[in-house]
Amino acid sequence: EVEKTACPSGKKAREIDESLIFYKKWELEACVDAALLATQMDRVNAIPFTYEQLDVLKHKLDELYPQGYPESVIQHLGYLFLKMSPEDIRKWNVTSLETLKALLEVNKGHEMSPQVATLIDRFVKGRGQLDKDTLDTLTAFYPGYLCSLSPEELSSVPPSSIWAVRPQDLDTCDPRQLDVLYPKARLAFQNMNGSEYFVKIQSFLGGAPTEDLKALSQQNVSMDLATFMKLRTDAVLPLTVAEVQKLLGPHVEGLKAEERHRPVRDWILRQRQDDLDTLGLGLQGGIPNGYLVLDLSMQEALS
């Protein structure tokens, strides 16, 4: 905390300008009026204030706005944003997407900090849902943003926002998250034709149920192995050899290289060896011919 001292004669700041970079910390405290600073925040970012000078400027704003800064100030914080704690940010009411963009720009190139996470949380909660423009903005700055949300938080994403999602935005999503996102994507892309639909839905298929995979197998989609390997094991297991062959098309040959990995390994164990042999890939581990397969889960359901 900077002690209160009188401003030296002739040093009272009439505007926020470059001359202030030569002021000592106590001079900034004594000679810069907090209300002047608040009205000229847009200038602060253009002036190369030192780390400690910025501490003083933040302190002045904190004194002026103990209940939290108004959005007119927040929008122009610039590098002062890096000085804010999550506690500071929780006092804010940020409603403008432009304000959000301005602050994310300051943090660009860095990991998502606790400050940024708090800011986004405040913003999204204020809006009530994660709309398309917000999602567009957040994934542009943080491609992994979507996958940092819990399934509960993802449930507030409207299907219309799914159009903003790029494949790389889903790279770190786990199956639970894709379970929530897939139905939204299916709804969002429902009016597209076959091949276009597959291109859009492909990155979300980690959340697809068996019946949707069966339907896709009838559409000559030629799913690549990387996508197939991300499918839910429980959704892949009921697929027949013929369905998997149709689903993968020319990529079916890749099954051999993946036969020891899930979901391929588990799927092989559920297929008749006869059927696997029809692929001509030398896949081993299927149910030997003549064995009866009992679906115990079905039996339990009936009893």
Partner: antibody, heavy 122, light 107 residues
Framework: QVQLVQSGAEVRAPGASVKISCKAS????????IHWVRQAPGQGLEWMGI????????AYAQKFQGRVTMTRDTSTSTVYMELSSLRSDDTAMYYC???????????????WGQGTLVTVSS | DIQMTQSPPTLSASVGDRVTITCRAS??????LAWYQQKPGKAPKLLIY???SLASGVPSRFSGSGSGAEFTLTISSLQPDDFATYYC?????????FGGGTKVEIK
């Protein structure tokens, strides 16, 4: 790669002015500040001032106030430093150098121009 | 202005030696201190920033330490390429100021 390329050596008579250029490439010009530092023959380094290429704001060390002017041309990513009323003790190597535009914790000079030798002699 | 004082002004050493250069500030500069290496006829080159962070591409034999008003640059095992002049610089407040330099020469 990051480069700051300065204009060639200059010889001036006492009382004259000199204008040196520093052309930036390999980085986003607007995201950095450009500083000017000089070094008299066999001497240490002396900070002259700073310019923000983005807004054009600038600040000069008190010693050079009234004699130095820093300007920029964003269309060519070039910064200029003009020093007037030259004296013999202004004979020095003049360097431009950059620092990132940041929260104040990065005002170290991470890339430097090759230097421009200014000789003041009658 | 903050005065930066380096010692020693000149240092004679041999290849393989451990070399330490000191920089003192006339007032507290926190950790806002950088070190540069300069060879004759060349521009200075950043070695260390924020007192102890190694700049990109700088060999790990260089290290920096200190905070407040006293800082050191250490070269753990002097190499032929390290004979040069070294400068410290504070960026705690304006004007930015440099130490007078320490010339490391061959013994």
């Amino acid at each position: 790669q990051v480069q700051l390329v300065q204009s060639g050596a200059e010889v001036r008579a006492p009382g004259a002015s000199v204008k040196i250029s520093c052309k930036a490439s390999g980085f986003t010009f607007r995201g950095y500040y450009i500083h000017w530092v000089r070094q008299a023959p066999g001497q240490g380094l002396e900070w002259m001032g700073i310019i923000n290429p983005s807004g054009g704001s600038r600040a000069y060390a008190q010693k050079f106030q009234g004699r130095v002017t820093m300007t920029r041309d964003t269309s060519t990513s070039t910064v200029y430093m003009e020093l007037s009323s030259l004296r013999s003790d202004d004979t020095a190597m003049y360097y431009c150098a950059r620092t990132a535009s940041c929260g104040g914790d990065c005002y170290y000079l991470d890339y430097w121009g090759q230097g421009t030798l200014v000789t003041v002699s009658s | 202005d903050i005065q930066m004082t380096q010692s020693p002004p000149t240092l004679s050493a041999s290849v393989g030696d451990r070399v330490t250069i000191t920089c003192r500030a006339s007032e507290n500069v926190n950790i806002w201190l950088a070190w540069y290496q300069q060879k004759p006829g060349k521009a200075p080159k950043l070695l260390i920033y924020k007192s102890s962070s190694l700049a990109s591409g700088v060999p790990s034999r260089f290290s920096g330490s200190g905070s407040g008003a006293e800082f050191t640059l250490t070269i753990s095992s002097l190499q032929p390429d390290d004979f040069a002049t070294y400068y410290c610089q504070q960026y705690q407040s304006y004007p930015l100021t440099f130490g007078g330099g320490t010339k490391v020469e061959i013994k």
